[in-house]
Interface confidence: medium
Amino acid sequence: ACDTATCVTHRLAGLLSRSGGVVKNNFVPTNVGSKAF
């Protein structure tokens, strides 16, 4: 699985579907302090 900063950030921001594609949804997480570059 992708474990770079961007991957983790995007997962936490609710941007990714199971296939890894970008999806638009209504999930708004709290800022749990995800990641960097």
Partner: antibody, heavy 122, light 107 residues
Framework: EVQLVESGGGLVQPGGSLRLSCAAS????????ISWVRQAPGKGLEWVAE??????????HYAEAVKGRFTISRDNAKNSLYLQMNSLRAEDTAVYYC?????????????WGQGTLVTVSS | EIVLTQSPATLSLSPGERATLSCKAS??????VSWYQQKPGQAPRLLIY???NRYLGIPARFSGSGSGTDFTLTISSLEPEDFAVYYC?????????FGQGTKLEIK
């Protein structure tokens, strides 16, 4: 307002050392992963190193070109990121940027500092 | 290491025209591609992340597409301030890598 301010650049001889700093403000520094990216004069962008958050044990990753010579570190109490550069080579001459990338709700945030120039020359 | 190849190296167009910039990855990177704009003496500015998501405050004339290994940045109608160097980057695998850049210049 998020701000990243790099310092510590300058002229150094081949084989010498230099320590860069990046002072962060406007966000909870300890929570975020942060990177150094460099750009040689007139050239493209090159990722250098990344350090993870305090909760991720400040784990690090490096580009192959700097592995064993450069060390990325952070001082969360000072909201500061560092890059210790040893055994410097002419090809390390570049503007060094610190950059942070994180989520805030559904909005991705990306910030870069203004850069600090490192010149390795005899 | 994943190599990103951008084309063309230089693109000469006039304001109002459409610009199409290409970025090809040597391995599959799903949608973990970003596009940056850089002007002389300035830090890079994020335009597109996740291959197709416009960053905050980026005008609608900028759009990104692609997945897997082939990615495209399109500027639908060039404004004078769009002439700059554009870089794609991948953050699917370490080390993060950037393309060599496409210089968009005024014809």
């Amino acid at each position: 307002e998020v701000q990243l301010v790099e310092s510590g650049g300058g002229l150094v001889q081949p084989g010498g050392s230099l320590r860069l700093s990046c002072a962060a403000s406007g966000f909870t520094f300890s929570n975020y992963w942060i990177s150094w990216v460099r750009q040689a004069p007139g050239k493209g962008l090159e990722w250098v190193a990344e350090i993870r958050s305090e909760s991720d044990a400040s784990a690090t990753h490096y580009a192959e070109a700097v592995k064993g010579r450069f060390t990325i570190s952070r001082d969360n109490a000072k909201n500061s990121l560092y890059l210790q550069m040893n055994s410097l080579r002419a090809e390390d001459t570049a503007v060094y940027y610190c950059a942070v990338y994180f989520d805030y709700g559904l909005a991705i945030q990306n910030y870069w500092g203004q850069g600090t120039l490192v010149t390795v020359s005899s | 290491e994943i190599v990103l190849t951008q084309s063309p190296a230089t693109l000469s167009l006039s304001p109002g025209e459409r610009a199409t910039l290409s970025c090809k990855a040597s391995k599959r990177v799903t949608t973990y591609v970003s596009w940056y704009q850089q002007k002389p003496g300035q830090a890079p500015r994020l335009l597109i992340y996740g291959a197709s998501n416009r960053y905050l405050g980026i005008p609608a004339r900028f759009s990104g597409s692609g997945s897997g290994t082939d990615f495209t940045l399109t500027i639908s109608s060039l404004e004078p301030e769009d002439f700059a160097v554009y870089y794609c980057s991948q953050s699917y695998n370490y080390p993060y890598t950037f393309g060599q850049g496409t210089k968009l210049e005024i014809k």
